[in-house]
Structure formats: structure tokens, C-alpha cells
């Protein structure tokens, strides 16, 4: 029969290095009789036999950690006791070795130029990983603005446009290397106007192009404001190249205005805005159409359809890039202005405007427009539209613009040919001939120096004294 023997640990525990998720085993070989009870502790806390993370075999002599976690790090001890003599103990350390792991990777960042950007990169690993950064395809060099912090994060002071790009952090130790996903650093730049629109002084009915160039990141949008409201007409062409937007507003000028270019871009929930303004003022509308070249053709437009003589040829002024279009838009704009005038004035003014903008034309080697006869112009001015005309002259002389008849392309009556001198040299307004049959009384107009008779106008008076000397802009 065997003699009782106190436990002796024949293979003391050693330090074990283990990788996360791998198996780690401690061996505690004991010689004794009778067979001892062996218990295991980790950091002096008993490991329970039924803990499924461990396997205890060979009568307790073999402790296996089935899948090592970084929290398993610590001092493991085995204690053997069989009641003979004292209990014996042996201890060894578990060092959990860990390939680098990025626990807080960097994320995409949008940052306004001049501010500070921090790209996080928190890592785990044993040995402790070193952290470096790559921008694009190259290792990022630290400098006075750019530093890798103790935590691994990348800090950039006073962010510049050239800092924009793709970044990734690299965590490295003796066991391996970990790379973060590529993240984008976007540097946002407040909208700024590089080229402001220029002011213009042009004739009525001219085309003007206002140009505004802006830069920013993201590329700004450009909007145009006319006298405080969104631009209602005109065409806008935009071109974007290298963060620069070039906007061109083409206008058909029928009234003066203040045009503002507004460049806007968005930074998160906030907007940045830059503004620049230009004025468009109107010079004298145009010289006599006899001085301008043109051609005779049928009127195909809509506005003056009911006013002009059917099938007649009208004069198109080739000082416009597209005469037919330009004159039609001009008359359309003019008619909109006439919405504000009296019912007596409006049809007469429409007849005057249509026959002035689309003058009857004699084709030939040199197509010649036929201006309106002075007497008909004066009839509109001093009979049908006397009140409106006086108001207009007062406003235009002060350089003001109001709705009604201001800045309309109306002729200067005193400069028109008289039908008394040459009835074939000027155009009659059929509307006024028709109205004389229906109108029996006209507003009484007195003139200090009666000078011109308006033939057959009106039916109730044999002659009507008017002054041809009114100036008209």
C-alpha cells in the first residue's frame, strides 16, 4: 500500500503569450498521494469549474482558455491540496498579444478653410501599435500645422484647400498592420466673388450681358436679383470649372435697373453669401431709323397683329442681332407697360407704338421705313393720351422710372414728317381715322402758339390746334 504524499508541483506555471481568439494553456503537473484537488484562480479570483470559457482537464492539471480575449490578461495560479501537508501553489502570467485593431476609425470630415480638423484613429494592440497616416498614396509628413497625437488622431491646424483629399490611418506592431478605410477631408471655402458685373449705360432695346464669376467650395450657385426681386426675364448661362462658376445674364433692356449677383454655398446647415451689384441705365433710345440699316418683310408676330395693316411689309432694323425677335419682345414689353394707362389712351398708344416699332416699309435697293405722320403722333400725344404724356414727360425729365408710358419706344412727334408736306412720306394710323367717326368730344387742349392742323380729326372740329414743339423721350 502507497504511503501518503504531500502535493508537489513538478512543472511550475510559466508566462504564456497568446493571441486574441487563440487557445492558451497553463500546465500544473502535481505529484501526490492521494490525488489532490486542484483549483485555479485568475488575479486571485476563483475560476469556476462550470465556466464555459475554460476547459479544466487531467484532474485539474490542465487549464485551457478556449478563446482568449484581451480581458483575459492577468496572473493565473493553480493550488493543489490533498490533506497531507500544506497546499502548494504555482503562478504564471497570461500576456494577451494583439494584432493592431482600429477601434475608432477616422470618418469623412467637411471643414471650413482656416479652422482646425481632427481625424480620429484610436487603436488597440499588444505591443501598443504605432500610428501613422497616409494621404492619397504617400505617407503624411508632420509639420507645424499637421501632427499625429498620442491617441493616434490626426490634427490639422488652420486647414488649407490643399489639405483636402483622402486619408487613412495605419496601426502597426510586431504582430501585424491594420489600415483604416479611406476617408475624405473636404475643405469648404466661403463663396467669394472674383469678378463683379459691370455697370452699363445703353439704349432702350439693347442687349446687355452681365457677367459674374465666383469661387468657393462647394462650388457656389449664382442667382441674379433685379431691383430687389428675382430676375423675371433674360437668359442665364453658367459654366463651372475648377471650383469657379461663371454666370452670364443676358438682358433685353427696356427699363433701368440695379442687378445684383449673389453667390451662395452651403456649409452644413449654414450658408455663405457674397454679393456684387451693377446698374443698367438707359441712354437716349435710338437715332432715326432712317440711319439704321434693315430689311422689309411681312410681320409674323402676335402683339401688333390686330393693329398693323394686313399683308403690309414692315421694316426690321438690323442693328439688332435678331431684328424680328428683338422688335417683338420690345413691343411685348411696351404693351405690358400700357396696362396702366386709361382705356381712351391705350388703343391709340398701341397703334402708335406698333406703327413706330414696325414702320411700313418700301422695299427697294435701300429698304426705307415710313415713319408715322406727325399729325397722328400729336393726336395720340395731345388728345388720347394727354394726361399720360404730361406725366411721362415730368417723370422722364427727372430721370425716374414708373409704370405707364415711361421709357416706351415712342417717337418724338416734332421730328416726324408732316402729311401736309408729303402725304406719301409717312404712315397714317387707321385706328385714329376710325375713332374720329365715333368720338365727338376731345379733351380741350389750348396751345400758346397754334401751328398744326390734324386733318379730319375729330369730326366735330374742322381744325384742332396743337403744338408740335413738345419734346419726347
Amino acid at each position: 500500500e502507497k504511503l501518503p504524499k504531500a502535493p508537489v508541483i513538478t512543472t511550475p506555471l510559466e508566462t504564456v503569450d497568446a493571441l486574441v481568439e487563440e487557445v492558451a494553456t497553463f500546465m500544473c503537473a502535481v505529484e501526490s498521494y492521494p490525488q489532490p484537488e486542484i483549483s485555479w484562480t485568475r488575479n486571485k479570483i476563483l475560476i469556476k469549474l462550470f465556466d464555459t470559457r475554460y476547459s479544466i482537464r487531467e484532474n485539474g492539471q490542465l487549464l485551457t482558455i478556449l478563446s482568449v480575449e484581451d480581458s483575459d490578461d492577468g496572473i493565473y495560479c493553480c493550488t493543489a491540496n490533498n490533506g497531507v501537508g500544506g497546499a502548494v501553489e504555482s503562478c504564471g502570467a497570461l500576456q494577451v498579444k494583439m494584432k493592431p485593431k482600429i477601434t475608432r476609425p477616422p470618418i469623412n470630415v467637411k471643414i471650413i478653410e482656416g479652422l482646425k480638423a481632427v481625424l480620429p484613429c484610436t487603436t488597440m494592440g499588444n505591443p501598443k501599435p504605432s500610428v501613422s497616416w497616409i494621404k492619397g498614396d504617400s505617407a503624411l509628413r508632420e509639420n507645424s500645422r499637421i501632427a499625429v497625437l498620442e491617441s493616434g488622431s490626426l490634427r490639422i491646424h488652420n486647414v488649407q484647400k490643399e489639405d483636402a483629399g483622402q486619408y487613412r490611418c495605419v496601426a502597426k506592431n510586431s504582430l501585424g498592420t491594420a489600415y483604416s478605410k479611406l476617408v475624405k477631408l473636404e475643405v469648404e471655402v466661403f463663396a467669394r466673388i472674383l469678378r463683379a458685373p459691370e455697370s452699363h449705360n445703353v439704349t432702350f432695346g439693347s442687349f446687355v450681358t452681365l457677367r459674374c464669376t465666383a469661387i468657393g467650395m462647394p462650388v457656389p450657385t449664382i442667382s441674379w436679383i433685379e431691383n430687389g426681386n428675382a430676375v423675371s426675364s433674360g437668359s442665364i448661362q453658367e459654366n463651372v470649372k475648377d471650383r469657379v462658376i461663371d454666370s452670364r445674364l443676358q438682358l433685353f433692356i427696356t427699363k433701368p435697373g440695379l442687378y445684383t449677383c449673389i453667390a451662395t454655398n452651403k456649409h452644413g446647415e449654414k450658408f455663405s453669401t457674397a454679393k456684387a451689384a451693377a446698374t443698367v441705365s438707359i441712354a437716349e433710345w435710338s437715332k432715326s431709323q432712317k440711319e439704321s440699316k434693315g430689311y422689309c418683310a411681312q410681320y409674323r408676330g402676335e402683339v401688333c397683329d390686330a393693329v398693323l395693316v394686313k399683308d403690309s411689309l414692315v421694316f426690321f432694323n438690323t442693328s439688332y442681332p435678331d431684328p424680328e425677335e428683338a422688335q417683338e419682345l420690345l413691343i411685348h414689353t411696351a404693351w405690358n407697360e400700357l396696362k396702366a394707362v386709361s382705356p381712351l389712351c391705350r388703343p391709340a398708344a398701341e397703334a402708335l407704338l406698333c406703327n413706330h416699332l414696325f414702320q411700313e416699309c418700301s422695299p427697294g435697293v435701300l429698304p426705307t421705313p415710313m415713319p408715322i405722320c406727325r399729325e397722328y403722333c400729336l393726336a395720340v400725344k395731345e388728345l388720347f393720351c394727354a394726361k399720360e404724356w404730361l406725366a411721362m414727360e415730368g417723370k422722364t425729365h427727372r430721370g425716374l422710372y414708373r409704370s405707364g408710358m415711361h421709357f416706351l419706344p415712342v417717337p418724338e412727334c416734332s421730328k416726324l414728317p408732316s402729311m401736309h408736306q408729303d402725304p406719301t412720306a409717312c404712315t397714317r394710323l387707321p385706328y385714329l381715322d376710325y375713332k374720329k367717326e365715333n368720338i365727338t368730344t376731345f379733351p380741350s387742349i389750348t396751345s400758346s402758339k397754334p401751328s398744326v392742323d390734324i386733318p379730319n380729326l375729330p369730326a366735330s372740329t374742322s381744325s384742332f390746334a396743337v403744338s408740335p414743339a413738345y419734346s419726347m423721350t
Epitope: R300, G301, E325
Partner: antibody
Framework: EVQLLESGGGLVQPGGSLRLSCAAS????????MSWVRQAPGKGLEWVSA????????YYKESVKGRFTISRDNSKNTLYLQMNSLRAEDTAVYYC??????????????WGQGTLVTVSS | QTVVTQEPSFSVSPGGTVTLTCGLS?????????PDWYQQTPGQAPRTLIY???SRHSGVPDRFSGSILGNKAALTITGAQADDESDYYC????????????FGGGTKLTVL
């Protein structure tokens, strides 16, 4: 790039109705006159109707007056042709066409691919 | 009723010059009819060549030119090429009681 896309064609019985639409893109629709032009199978082009930029006037070929209505919705960049009391002779490919300027009778400078209208019992 | 007349067919040799005309059954074609010319190949939508007598549409080669010859509108193709083989239509603005736009019957051009 100017694009005109017609839709709404199909087979309809004599006396029936159809509404053609033309969706416009690539230009400022409200600045241009528009037209409908048709082409019967194996035949030549035939102007049907025109409308200026503002939509304030409308013009029609004599044989469709009173039966067809052209209209436009500048806010939707869309041209329409409402065709009522259709006849066998209205069978054709209907083209939507853009005018070169604001007026209804400028040159036709851009065309859609057309939509076929068949009037048959 | 305005009737616009065109030659039904025409042929030209490659490299040759051809002039297609467009007339009115009653009266002369003038610049006031704003003659336009269109080209159409089978199965395709028409394409604008010339507008308002002699203005070339953008992208149209300068081999194509428009004019008024006598009492007709004319489309001249110089240095004809195989892919010029198409139907050619003229369109005229006309005012006879009401505004109208009238196409000719078209000319089938063959490049031999």
C-alpha cells in the same frame, strides 16, 4: 441639348379624341414659339398648329380648326395638342417642333421623334 | 389655299451641285415668306438646314445654301455627298386671310 419628347399617340376610332403632350428640356421653354407638324404614312410634312412663347395666340391649319386645340404650360415645359372629332385623314406621325424664337412662325429649329396617331375603326 | 410646289425628285452625282426650288402656285416667293429648308431621312425626324431664306442652322455644313432665285426659293447643295440622299422640304410663311405655315410636297434627292 434641346430635347422634345412626344407622348399620347395611339389607336383611336373616328370621332374619338386624343391629347398629345410634348415635354421640352435643354432650353428655356417659355422663350420660344412651338408647333405641331404631322406626316401621314409615306407622305410629306404638314403643318398643323402653332403657338407663340406667351401662349397668347394660337394658329391652325384650316382642316383642323375647331377640332384641334394647341396649348402650353410654361411652368411644366410642356406643349399640348388636344385632338377631337378625329378623322381617318388625321392618321400620321405627329412631331412637336420648337421655333427659332418667340413668335409662332419662326423657323422650326428642333424636332421631337414623333408619336403615331392612328384613326381607324 | 396656298400650295407650295417642289420638284418631286432630283438626282446628282457625288461631288456635283444641285439646286432644289420651292414655288407658290399663285405668285412669287419673296423673303416675306421666310423660306425654310428641312432635310429628312427615312424613319427619322426632320432636321433644319436653312431658315429665313439664307440663314444656315447651326451645325449645317456650308455646302448647303439658301437664296431666292427669280420667283422661287432655292436650296443649293454644292459638292454633294452620299449621305445627302434624303427628302428635302421647304416651308413658307403665308398670310392669306390668316397666318399659315405651309410645307412643299418634298423633293427626293438621289446621289448617284
Amino acid at each position: 441639348e434641346v430635347q422634345l419628347l412626344e407622348s399620347g399617340g395611339g389607336l383611336v376610332q373616328p370621332g374619338g379624341s386624343l391629347r398629345l403632350s410634348c415635354a421640352a428640356s435643354g432650353f428655356t421653354f417659355s422663350d420660344y414659339g412651338m408647333s405641331w407638324v404631322r406626316q401621314a404614312p409615306g407622305k410629306g410634312l404638314e403643318w398643323v398648329s402653332a403657338i407663340p412663347w406667351s401662349g397668347g395666340s394660337t394658329y391652325y391649319k384650316e382642316s383642323v380648326k375647331g377640332r384641334f386645340t394647341i396649348s402650353r404650360d410654361n411652368s411644366k415645359n410642356t406643349l399640348y395638342l388636344q385632338m377631337n372629332s378625329l378623322r381617318a385623314e388625321d392618321t400620321a406621325v405627329y412631331y412637336c417642333a420648337k421655333r427659332s424664337g418667340r413668335i409662332a412662325f419662326g423657323a422650326l429649329d428642333a424636332w421631337g421623334q414623333g408619336t403615331l396617331v392612328t384613326v381607324s375603326s | 389655299q396656298t400650295v407650295v410646289t417642289q420638284e418631286p425628285s432630283f438626282s446628282v452625282s457625288p461631288g456635283g451641285t444641285v439646286t432644289l426650288t420651292c414655288g407658290l402656285s399663285s405668285g412669287s416667293v419673296t423673303s416675306s415668306n421666310y423660306p425654310d429648308w428641312y432635310q429628312q431621312t427615312p424613319g427619322q425626324a426632320p432636321r433644319t438646314l436653312i431658315y429665313s431664306t439664307d440663314s444656315r442652322h447651326s451645325g449645317v455644313p456650308d455646302r448647303f445654301s439658301g437664296s431666292i432665285l427669280g420667283n422661287k426659293a432655292a436650296l443649293t447643295i454644292t459638292g454633294a455627298q452620299a449621305d445627302d440622299e434624303s427628302d428635302y422640304y421647304c416651308g413658307l410663311y403665308s398670310y392669306s386671310g390668316s397666318k399659315n405655315y405651309v410645307f412643299g410636297g418634298g423633293t427626293k434627292l438621289t446621289v448617284l
